[in-house]
């Protein structure tokens, strides 16, 4: 029980993460302009990874796509491809995790294979996670160095006359959504990690052999999964699997290859 | 048609308020900031402030700040400048006008008189 | 405070010439963001309220006649009349639309020689 809940909510932890992941690389404040010496601006900055956006008091806002792929900082591109690459690992992530899932049954899929794909979309969700801390940590420390360097020549005059202000950017909150939500994707992961290790079958507790009456054959029924041992018309003990429709609570109550008697 | 309509001129003495009115019609009142620009008799053009009818929003000019009190009545669409403690200096002609794009002003009403007199 | 400074402060022109309004502010207009000079221009004729002109220091709003036309970048700026007609004489005005306050030129007044 304590397996399936660590599972699912890792699922759902790291589904809500890519979904975080997926929001901040398509937002457009990465980046906005500081406010901090004109508090109230007539006209406000803003930039994504995508596009650049201007919002004037007016209430009407230009944004321009960055229409060039080799005029832009190799920073800028190396933040879109962890993004991008977060985003798709997370996506084959939550794929391989749907089918790794305890409470959903896919034909006859064993639990050691449940608990490969569970480690596997765990490990990606771990690394999507990364990618996404990555990103986001790349592009806010590109941001501090900027700020500084545009503070050091903050105004460049003209005989002192005129003045020419440059922009300054800081944090914008694509950065704080993309932070989050790279953490849960790492939370989910390593959740499914732990989750895996409750999954995978332990071979040692099921050693006991089970000794039958001579003569007793077992019979295989076709198509089916498990062996039943054959007590005449006793039933009790006959169970053939046939992959059918099946409760939770059997699937529960056949943790291993073996039948006990 | 867009137009902006004003109240009618208004004569105070020193010391007093006074409220002017600007009803919007022909567009969305939300969608646009209302600008308020005070001009004196044979002079320039000085801009008081703004509202963003949708969250009320306000923004003044230091030198009105304090003074002016702009709002907005969305279910009427209209706009209102209080200018109080009103002195000499106060008389002119004042106008609202609706910003657009580029942080223009595209439409401006006929402008209301004050007259500050004791 | 951006001060708008205009010149001349008035000027007459026949008609049909060219008339040449320059305005400048302390401190520069450009937005960086979308390379967009946030200068306006506004005609007042007698008795009348402003009426804009142009915007983002070159377009022209829709209805003005194409003699009228705007350019500059940064802080300096000029409106120019390529051919005055009669009913342009008015008095003219530059604005900072970038920054608050919103701050206007003293104005020029454009007569008829």
């Known amino acids: 029980m304590a397996v399936t809940a660590c599972q699912g909510l890792g699922f759902v932890v790291s589904l809500i993460g890519i979904a975080g992941i997926i929001a901040a690389t398509c937002m457009d404040q990465w980046s906005t302009q500081d406010l901090y010496n004109n508090p109230v601006t007539a006209v406000f900055n803003y930039q994504g990874l995508w596009r650049s956006c201007v919002r004037e008091s007016s209430g009407f806002t230009e944004c321009r796509g960055y229409f060039t792929l080799l005029g832009l900082p190799a920073m800028l591109q190396a933040v879109r491809a962890l993004m991008i690459v977060g985003i798709v690992l997370g996506a084959i992530g939550l794929l391989v995790s749907i089918f790794a899932l305890k409470c959903i049954r896919i034909g006859s899929m064993e639990d050691s294979a449940k608990a490969n794909m569970t480690l596997t979309s765990g490990i990606m969700f771990i690394v999507s996670g990364l990618c996404a801390i990555a990103g986001v940590s790349v592009f806010a420390n590109m941001l501090v160095t900027n700020f500084w360097m545009s503070t050091a020549n903050m105004y460049t005059g003209m005989g002192g006359m005129v003045q020419t202000v440059q922009t300054r950017y800081t944090f914008g909150a694509a950065l704080f959504v993309g932070w989050v939500a790279g953490g849960l994707t790492l939370i989910g992961g390593v959740m499914m990690c732990i989750a895996c290790r409750g999954l995978a079958p332990e071979e040692t507790n099921y050693k006991a052999v089970s000794y039958h009456a001579s003569g007793h054959s077992v019979a295989y029924k076709p198509g089916g999964f498990k062996a039943s041992t054959g007590f005449g018309s006793n039933t009790k003990n006959k169970k053939i699997y046939d992959g059918g429709a099946r409760t939770e609570d059997e699937v529960q109550s056949y943790p291993s290859k073996h039948d006990y008697v | 048609q867009v137009q902006l309509v004003q109240s009618g001129a208004e004569v105070k003495k020193p010391g007093a308020s006074v409220k002017l009115s600007c009803k919007a019609s022909?567009?969305?009142?939300?969608?646009?900031?209302i600008n308020w620009v005070k001009q004196k008799t044979g002079q320039g053009l000085e801009w008081i402030g703004e509202?963003?009818?949708?969250?009320?929003?306000?923004y003044y000019s230091e030198k009105f700040r304090g003074r002016a009190t702009l709002t907005a009545d969305k279910s009427i669409s209209t706009a209102y400048m209080e200018l109080s403690s009103l002195r000499s200096e106060d008389t002119a002609v004042y106008f609202c006008a609706r910003l657009r794009r580029g942080n223009a002003m595209d439409y401006w009403d006929q402008g209301t008189t004050v007259t500050v007199s004791s | 405070d951006i001060v708008m400074t205009q010149s001349p402060s008035s000027l007459a022109v026949s008609l049909g010439e060219m008339a040449t309004i320059n305005c400048k502010s302390s401190q520069s207009l450009l937005n960086s963001g979308n390379q967009r000079n946030y200068l306006t221009w506004y005609q007042q004729k007698p008795g009348q309220p402003p009426k804009l002109l142009i915007y983002w220091a070159s377009t022209r709003e829709s209805g003005v006649p194409d003699r009228f036309s705007g350019s500059g970048s940064g802080t300096d700026f000029t409106l120019t009349i390529s051919s005055l007609q009669a009913e342009d004489v008015a008095v003219y005005y530059c604005q900072n639309s970038y920054n608050y306050p919103y701050t206007f030129g003293q104005g020029t007044k454009l007569e008829r020689k």
């Open positions: 509202i963003h009818p949708r969250g009320g929003n306000t």
């Open positions: 022909g567009y969305t009142f939300t969608s646009y900031v």
